[in-house]
Interface confidence: low
């Protein structure tokens, strides 16, 4: 039982502290009172707190807790946000380089294809960017579209330059023939495999980083329960009611209170650990065909090889396509 | 063989990026991120302790507050009495996580499963198929240059890693880094409403 306050005890000290929290002094008693209406700072004797003060302390305690939580996660949040932005931009740069490499290959090796090839290559790499960012695009379709678009141009410009420019009718037939005759050999399949694997991994890597940000944001902005507010108030502010302005909470007591307040948040721990370890596993596997940088920056060479493959088989192909698309060609020459 | 595409860099900064030898690579940057993230692997389980160490707690004082009275820092009462007659701490824990936390746990489960699927053989079925089709004939040298494309005269060496950071300049200015702003962080002043 604490000694009763002296007969001349006042609540001046408490009042001057409380004034910083809540300008307007009418809530603080002049002298210690029984405090029978208090619900959190239950008095063992006369107290300098009122019910209204208690409510204010609870509000402040919860705010403090929210600030402390945000401060705790600031470094982690910054790390993930910064890296998510860095990698997103880096992947965009890789895509831009890959496009430039491929365009350069066309310009230097197949200048007659360039205007159209640039357009198709541009569309392909735009789709690559969208896919990395999470768009519902199918990688196989992207690759097929690239080769479907390239082949009519290769056929009319390199293999059969005598055809008129308005080869619209034959284009459709050539697009179909491209797949049926496996005009580019296995190269489209190779590119599909490499591109889809490397982009899938890249996309999920970015997705995981963005979810990491969402996790931190969620726990960063948690609203603490009334029960927690009461516990925090008892720990941080109830001492003031007894005029004990300079004392601090006991360490063990603080840990018990925090574990109570954060019981829900701590449940994330298991999945957070697994998240970091799974992300590490993914990153360790991001090499060779699982490394989009490696795959995309080498695409120009594979596409070049695929065109060489077409040129090697040009004679046989021209004959077959001549028969296959004869109907379209006759209509054109008329 | 394919003409090395060096003269069609639409923006000239790319040349600088492609040929810087000592900048970080994307893969080293990824590994660095993982190492930093791993230092936060216990972030959530360590939160209660972290918050106590960053809020006013009696460290050197002989006496401390246990929620009801002033006690000696090492006495039994220091941790126990404050919880009496208030509400059951166990009950508080039993309420389980808030819906918003449950939702984020579900999302983490989803992404963890996805990450595992991509890392496990189940997500990597095509490795051997590639070799069977004869598209990959092993790595080309054991440095970080990698051979790309077919064999024969079509093969050229491309620098495997893009030295992208020369262009990115990702390091923030010191002024932008957290804790260096003029705004007082809770760590600096122990929250403006604590007056010790």
């Amino acid at each position: 039982q604490p000694p009763p306050p002296p007969p001349d005890a006042t609540c001046h000290q408490v009042r001057s502290f409380f004034q910083r929290l809540q300008p307007g002094l009418k809530w603080v008693p002049e002298t210690p009172v029984p405090g029978s209406d208090l619900q959190v700072c239950l008095p063992k004797g006369p107290t300098c707190c009122s019910r209204k003060m208690e409510e204010k302390y609870q509000l402040t305690a919860r705010l403090n807790m929210e600030q402390l939580l945000q401060s705790a996660s600031m470094e982690l949040k910054f790390l993930i946000i910064q890296n998510a932005a860095v990698f997103q931009e880096a992947f965009e740069i890789v895509v831009r380089h890959a496009k430039n490499y491929t365009n350069a290959m066309f310009k230097n090796n197949y200048p007659s294809l360039t205007p159209q090839a640039f357009e198709f290559v541009g569309e392909f790499f735009t789709d690559v960017s969208l896919y990395i960012l999470g768009s519902d695009i199918n990688v196989d379709d992207m690759v097929n579209e690239l080769f479907d678009s390239l082949f009519p141009v290769i056929y009319t410009q390199l293999m059969n330059p005598g055809l008129p420019d308005s080869a619209l009718d034959i284009n459709e037939c050539l697009r179909g023939a491209r797949r049926d005759l496996k005009v580019f050999g296995n190269f489209p399949k190779l590119i599909m495999t490499q591109v889809s694997k490397s982009l899938q991994v890249t996309r999920i890597f970015l997705q995981a980083l963005n979810l990491g940000i969402e996790v931190i944001n969620t726990t960063d902005h948690l609203k603490f329960s009334k029960d927690c507010g009461r516990m925090l108030t008892r720990m941080w502010y109830c001492s003031y009611c007894q005029g004990l302005m300079m004392v601090k909470p006991c360490g063990g007591y603080c840990n018990v209170v925090m574990q109570g307040c954060m019981a829900g948040v701590v449940e994330i721990d298991k999945y957070w650990r697994e998240y970091i370890l799974s992300l590490e596993e993914l990153v360790n596997g991001m090499y060779r065909i699982y490394d989009m940088e490696n795959v995309l920056l080498g695409l120009f060479s594979t596409i070049h090889d695929s065109i060489q493959y077409v040129q090697k088989n040009a004679g046989k192909l021209t004959t077959t396509i001549g028969k296959l698309c004869a109907h379209s060609q006759q209509r054109q020459y008329r | 063989s394919a003409y090395y595409p060096e003269d069609l860099f639409i923006d000239k900064k790319v040349l600088k990026v492609a040929h810087v030898e000592h900048e970080e690579t994307l893969s080293s940057r990824r590994r660095e991120l993982i190492q930093k993230l791993k230092s936060f692997i216990s972030f959530y389980s360590a939160l209660p302790g972290y918050i106590c160490s960053h809020s006013p707690v009696a460290e050197n004082d002989t006496l401390c507050w246990n929620g009801q009275e002033l006690v000696e820092r090492y006495s039994q009462k220091a941790a126990r009495n404050g919880m009496k007659n208030q509400f059951n701490l166990h009950e508080l824990k039993m309420k389980g996580p808030e819906p918003v936390v449950s939702q984020i746990i579900d999302k983490l489960k989803h992404i963890n499963q996805l990450l595992r699927t991509m890392s496990m053989p189940k997500g990597r079925v095509l490795d051997k198929n590639l070799d069977e089709e004869g598209f990959e004939s092993g790595d080309c040298g054991d440095d970080e240059d990698e051979c790309i494309g077919g064999s024969g005269d079509g093969m050229i060496k491309v620098k495997n890693q893009l030295r992208f950071l020369a262009e990115l300049a990702y390091d923030l200015d010191v002024d932008d880094a957290p804790g260096n702003s003029q705004q007082a962080t809770p760590k600096d002043n122990e929250i403006s409403t604590f007056h010790n």
């Epitope: 999470g134 768009s135 519902d136 695009i137 199918n138 997705q207 969402e214 | 489960k109 989803h110 992404i111």
Partner: antibody, heavy 120, light 108 residues
Framework: EVQLVQSGAEVKKPGSSVKVSCKAS????????ISWVRQAPGQGLEWMGG????????NYAQKFQGRVTITADELTSTAYMELSSLRSEDTAVYYC?????????????WGQGTLVTVSS | QSVLTQPPSVSVAPGKTARITCGGN??????VHWYQQKPGQAPVLVIY???DRPSGIPERFSGSNSGNTATLTISRVEAGDEADYYC???????????FGGGTKLTVL
């Protein structure tokens, strides 16, 4: 907790179009993939197409290609599905469903469904 | 294109275990999700990634997936479990979701 609230039941004539809305609340709308799934009376679930609001590009099932248009308005966190050239076999309950990110995540939240009746 | 085959109906006595199968070529290599749909209501996710349970779904619901069959198991079946159950995978070639035909679970 994400909540998806759909527009009310519709009765339409064959040959006309219907536009069903799906308003999302409680989540980051732009990063969710919103799909539309329909269920004819006494039948199973059939995926029609989907959209990720942050990209705006939609992806459709082959069967509905050319007849369905899926859009999203980030400002109002609302996704729309418009089905044209309606026929009696389009009579069904149309659901919107959301999922986190990309394949192969499940549809974790569903709207209450919108009954569209096509009848002359 | 993936095709998923489910039995049209399964009957089980209260308190017993119900098993609903979902057949598909090499389905074990895919992630399977299960949905419960009660009459007049929207589907509800009950199992995802073969065997994970969303919060709020009783532990009585479990899943497994290997070879050519995925299975949803409901132990200690209750009257409230009576519903249609659908399996779903993502078809990797089209990147589109595919649903099974559905199984009506009747609690006797």
């Amino acid at each position: 907790e994400v909540q998806l609230v759909q527009s009310g039941a519709e009765v339409k004539k064959p040959g006309s179009s219907v536009k069903v809305s799906c308003k999302a609340s409680g989540g980051t709308f732009r990063s969710y993939a919103i799909s539309w799934v329909r269920q004819a009376p006494g039948q199973g679930l059939e995926w029609m197409g989907g959209i990720i609001p942050i990209f705006g590009t939609a992806n459709y099932a082959q069967k509905f290609q050319g007849r369905v248009t899926i859009t999203a308005d980030e400002l109002t966190s609302t996704a729309y599905m418009e089905l044209s050239s309606l026929r009696s076999e389009d009579t069904a309950v149309y659901y919107c469903a959301s999922r986190i990110g990309q394949w192969p995540t499940p549809f974790d939240y569903w709207g209450q469904g919108t009954l569209v009746t096509v009848s002359s | 294109q993936s095709v998923l085959t489910q039995p049209p109906s399964v009957s089980v006595a209260p308190g017993k275990t119900a098993r609903i199968t979902c057949g598909g070529n090499n389905i074990g290599s895919k992630s399977v999700h299960w949905y419960q749909q009660k009459p007049g209501q929207a589907p509800v996710l009950v199992i995802y990634y073969d065997s994970d349970r969303p919060s709020g779904i009783p532990e009585r619901f479990s899943g497994s997936n290997s070879g050519n069959t995925a299975t949803l198991t409901i132990s200690r079946v209750e009257a409230g479990d009576e519903a249609d159950y659908y399996c779903q995978v993502w078809d990797s070639s089209s990147d589109h979701p595919v649903f099974g035909g559905g199984t009506k679970l009747t609690v006797l």
